[in-house]
């Protein structure tokens, strides 16, 4: 029989019969090492590779370019997969992006994009998106016309300011744009009126810091 092909992403994992959410090892094209990721097999049909997760403020997201490049945290909890891995995965085939959000009142919402990929490091991991739908606002809180990734030590935004320093965290800032899911984690009662919180403008406004976020990707042809 044919030799089993390694999993490229969580869609491959799901289609191989593993339909329980959890940590799996995937083998991404052009990456020398396998990568442990959290696979969400429950939301909207499953097969989602989680690239970002926030839930309790246990992990510091105010990090530099190199850390955002290679990733940090643990897929069992809060983590950022790493821009190099996100670039490599989304270069394999066409992907969609789903973002799950929850506020401090327990309200859940999502934003979904029909197409998602990012550029390579030379392109500052530029964000490419198409086709926004979802319940987290009629308008997209991610920049649709393209934005470069910025960190505290790499200012690639379109502001006279330094968005990543001011608003904390690495993100696809514009000036500074309507979102930042890698901002400071604020607990209930402290989460209002914050410039540098976990923001999704068209869900909860410009200065409300969210309770939890998950960014996940899945092949378009899943």
């Amino acid at each position: 029989r044919e030799e089993e092909k390694p999993f490229r992403d969580c869609a491959d994992v799901y289609q191989a019969g593993f339909n329980k959410s959890g940590i799996y090892t995937i083998y991404i094209n052009n990456m020398p090492e396998p990568k442990k990721v959290f696979c969400n097999m429950d939301v909207n049909g499953g097969g989602w590779t989680v690239i970002q997760h926030r839930e309790d403020g246990s992990l510091d997201f105010q990090r530099g370019w190199k850390e955002y490049k290679m990733g940090f945290g643990n897929p069992s909890g809060e983590y950022w997969l790493g821009n190099e891995f996100i670039f490599a995965i989304t270069s394999q085939r066409q992907y969609m992006l789903r973002i799950e959000l929850m506020d401090w009142e327990g309200n859940r919402a999502y934003s979904q994009y029909d197409r998602f990929h990012i550029g390579n490091e030379k392109q500052n991991y530029r964000l490419y998106l198409k086709g926004h739908t979802g319940t987290a606002g009629k308008q997209s809180s991610l920049i649709l016309h393209g934005a470069d990734f910025s960190t505290k030590d790499a200012d690639n935004d379109n502001c006279m300011c330094k968005c990543a320093l001011m608003l904390t965290g690495g993100w696809w800032f514009d000036a500074c744009g309507p979102s930042n899911l890698n901002g400071m984690f604020y607990t209930a009662g402290q989460n209002h009126g914050k410039l540098n919180g976990i923001k999704w403008h068209y869900f909860k406004g410009p200065s409300y810091s969210l309770r939890s976020t998950t960014m996940m990707i899945r092949p378009l042809d899943f």
């Epitope: 502001c159 006279m160 514009d174 500074c176 309507p178 410009p206 200065s207």
Partner: antibody, heavy 122, light 112 residues
Amino acid sequence: EVQLVQSGGGVVQPGRSLRLSCAASGFTFSSYGMHWVRQAPGKGLEWVSYISSSGSTIYYADSVKGRFTISRDNAKNSLYLQMNSLRAEDTAVYYCARDLLDYDIWTGYGYWGQGTLVTVSS
Amino acid sequence: DIVMTQSPLSLPVTPGEPASISCRSSQSLLHSNGYNMLDWYLQKPGQSPQLLIYLGSNRASGVPDRFSGSGSGTDFTLKISRVEAEDVGVYYCMQGTHWPPTFGQGTKLEIK
């Protein structure tokens, strides 16, 4: 390149009206709060009015409340200041200014127009 | 309204020497968002004002690193480590913590 180009200044008699315009380019105008700031001859800067990105929130300085009206047309990338019942003390260079940050997060004025002189004199 | 008081109002400086401008507010400018909403602007002769420092201590893009802002609460300072001829003009501090926004009366920097 961000540009704010102003027009509409001039000499006007007390009690009359004037409309200032500010044409924006080089950025997504509909994402930014906008302000009018004025400077009387030889004096300092004075904030006049603010309008949010969608136009839903508006503020005025007490000195102009009830006489001045700020508005915007996002389709035309333009900001306006309608000045009625003008007084001698309204004589100043008027600047339009854009918020530094988008989405109505105000941390100051990132960009300024070139200014337009309004002289109120009989 | 918040009163912003700058000193000195006039500042003659020799090129290459440091300069310092003080700005005091009648109430604390520490906003509930955790930032001091205090900016510094420079208005060069015959020009529109330009942003130098935002949120008390953050230098705007393109502003030379000889400019620095510091302070918190009610007391703020703009420092120029080595004054150059192109730095002449009127410097204004401005607060945005309490509505309406208010400016200091300005400090005129001139070359000796």
